[in-house]
């Protein structure tokens, strides 16, 4: 805490400008009006304040807004955002996507901090669901964002938002998450034709049931091994050799290279040797 001291004569700040970098911490506390600071927050980022000086400015805003900052201030926090604690952020009501983008920009290139996680959580809860624009923004800054959500949280994603999801956004998702996302993707892309549908649904297939895989095998999709290896083992096991051959198309010979990895290994063990031999790959059941 900075002690309350009177502002020396002639040092009262009429505006937020570069002259303030020469103020000592106690002078900033005494001579900068909190309301002025709040209205001129956009200037703070252009001024090379020290971390200690930023602490004083944060303290002034905390005193002015004990219940949490208004969005007009939050949007212009800039690097001062890095000084906020998750507890501070929980008091905020952020509703504008522009505000969210501005704060995510400050943290760009870094891993998701507890502050950012809290901010996103507050924002999404405020909106009630993960809409397409929000998802677009979040995955642009954090490609792994979607896979950091629990299956319960993912259930609030509307099918329309699935259009914003890129394949790389699903890289770190586990089967339980894909189980939630796959039916939404199936619904979102249902009006697309065969080949276009497969391109879009491919990344979500780790949540697909056997009957959907059987249906895909009739559509000449040529699934690659990277996708096949992400399929649920329980969904792959009932597939026949002929169905897998149709599903993989020219990629079927890749089964040989993966014959000891799940789910290929488990699938091979379920097949009759005569059927496996028709592939000509030397797979041993």
């Amino acid at each position: 805490e900075v002690e309350k001291t009177a502002c020396p004569s002639g040092k009262k700040a009429p505006e937020i400008d570069e002259s303030l970098i020469f103020y000592k911490k106690w002078e900033l506390e005494a001579c900068v009006d909190a309301a002025l600071l709040a209205t001129q927050m956009d200037r703070v980022n252009a001024i090379p304040f020290t971390y200690e000086q930023l602490d004083v400015l944060k303290h002034k805003l905390d005193e002015l807004y004990p219940q949490g900052y208004p969005e007009s201030v939050i949007q212009h926090l800039g690097y001062l955002f890095l000084k906020m604690s998750p507890e501070d952020i929980r008091k905020w009501n952020v509703t504008s996507l522009e505000t969210l983008k501005a704060l995510l920009e400050v943290n760009k290139g870094h891993e998701m901090s507890p502050q950012v996680a809290t901010l996103i959580d507050r924002f999404v809860k405020g909106r009630g669901q993960l809409d397409k624009d929000t998802l677009d923004t979040l995955t642009a800054f954090y490609p792994g964002y979607l896979c950091s959500l629990s299956p319960e949280e993912l259930s609030s994603v509307p099918p329309s938002s699935i259009w914003a999801v890129r394949p790389q956004d699903l890289d770190t998702c586990d089967p339980r998450q894909l189980d939630v996302l796959y039916p939404k993707a199936r619904l979102a892309f249902q009006n697309m034709n065969g080949s276009e549908y497969f391109v879009k649904i491919q990344s979500f297939l780790g949540g697909a049931p056997t009957e959907d895989l059987k249906a895909l095998s009739q559509q000449n999709v040529s699934m690659d091994l990277a996708t096949f290896m992400k399929l649920r083992t329980d969904a792959v096991l009932p597939l026949t050799v002929a169905e897998v051959q149709k599903l993989l198309g020219p990629h079927v010979e890749g089964l040989k290279a993966e014959e000891r990895h799940r789910p290929v290994r488990d699938w091979i063990l379920r097949q009759r040797q005569d059927d496996l031999d028709t592939l000509g790959l030397g797979l041993q059941g």
């Epitope: 394949p167 690659d224 992400k230 890749g254 030397g282």
Partner: antibody, heavy 119, light 106 residues
């Protein structure tokens, strides 16, 4: 540009363990298995085993079963190989190498990690 | 396990000369892969699926063969080709490499 960046050289005592890391960048980590290969000085290459980042499924050359433990951390696109109960026979350069799922060859290799086991 | 025998173990060639090295397999395999390794460096993929050139590999390199007999050819030797060359198979477990052919420049 695809890169596999391995951890630095290690000098360890017999009987101990060591963990080598391999951080991948420049492509989709989960579309490839991560394999590990051993090369003793002046000798050929020996395949140790590989791991599928999607399922954490591992396969090992029987010769290295119990000697090497392979793991991955998908969130950081990093593969690890722990070598246990080290002896002078384990002194070698260890490479991580990327293998596209369904393919039999290694299209990118790490720079190698030199392990020296000596008392 | 499948054993890959490379020959010769060591060879030398003059710049511009044609070079051929072989990889013999004790059991029939579907494909062979070739790698080049220079001293102090990691192996580099040269040829996959027996005869397909890897990305960025000069066209003077070529691979051929089937069953149990495979070869790597350099149509015109260059100084930068001095290295050790390894063949590898992925048809049978465990996956194995040949002992290598060391190619020196005359």
């Amino acid at each position: 540009e695809v890169q596999l960046q391995q951890s630095g050289p290690e000098l360890v005592k017999p009987g101990t363990s060591v963990k080598i890391l391999c951080k991948a960048s420049g492509d989709t980590f989960t579309a490839y298995n991560m394999d590990w290969v051993k090369q003793r000085h002046g000798q050929s290459l020996e395949w140790i085993g590989d791991i599928n980042p999607n399922t954490d499924s591992t396969i090992y050359n029987q010769k290295f079963e119990g000697k090497a433990i392979l793991t991955v951390d998908k969130s950081s696109s990093t593969a690890y190989m722990e070598l246990r109960s080290l002896t002078s026979e384990d002194t070698a350069v260890y490479y991580c190498a990327r293998r596209k799922l369904g393919r039999g060859y290694f299209d990118y290799w790490g720079q190698g990690t030199t392990l020296t086991v000596s008392s | 396990q499948i054993v890959l025998t490379q020959s010769p173990a060591i060879m030398s060639a003059s710049p511009g000369e044609k070079v051929t090295m072989t990889c013999s397999v004790n059991l029939s395999v579907r494909y062979i892969y070739w790698y080049q390794q220079k001293p102090g460096s990691s192996p580099r993929l040269l040829i996959h699926d027996t005869s397909n050139l890897a990305s960025g590999v000069p066209v003077r390199f070529s691979g051929s063969g089937s069953g149990t007999s495979y070869s790597l050819t350099i149509s015109r030797m260059e100084a930068e080709d001095a290295a050790t060359y390894y063949c590898q198979q992925w048809s049978s477990f465990p996956y194995t490499f040949g002992g290598g052919t060391k190619l020196e420049i005359k």
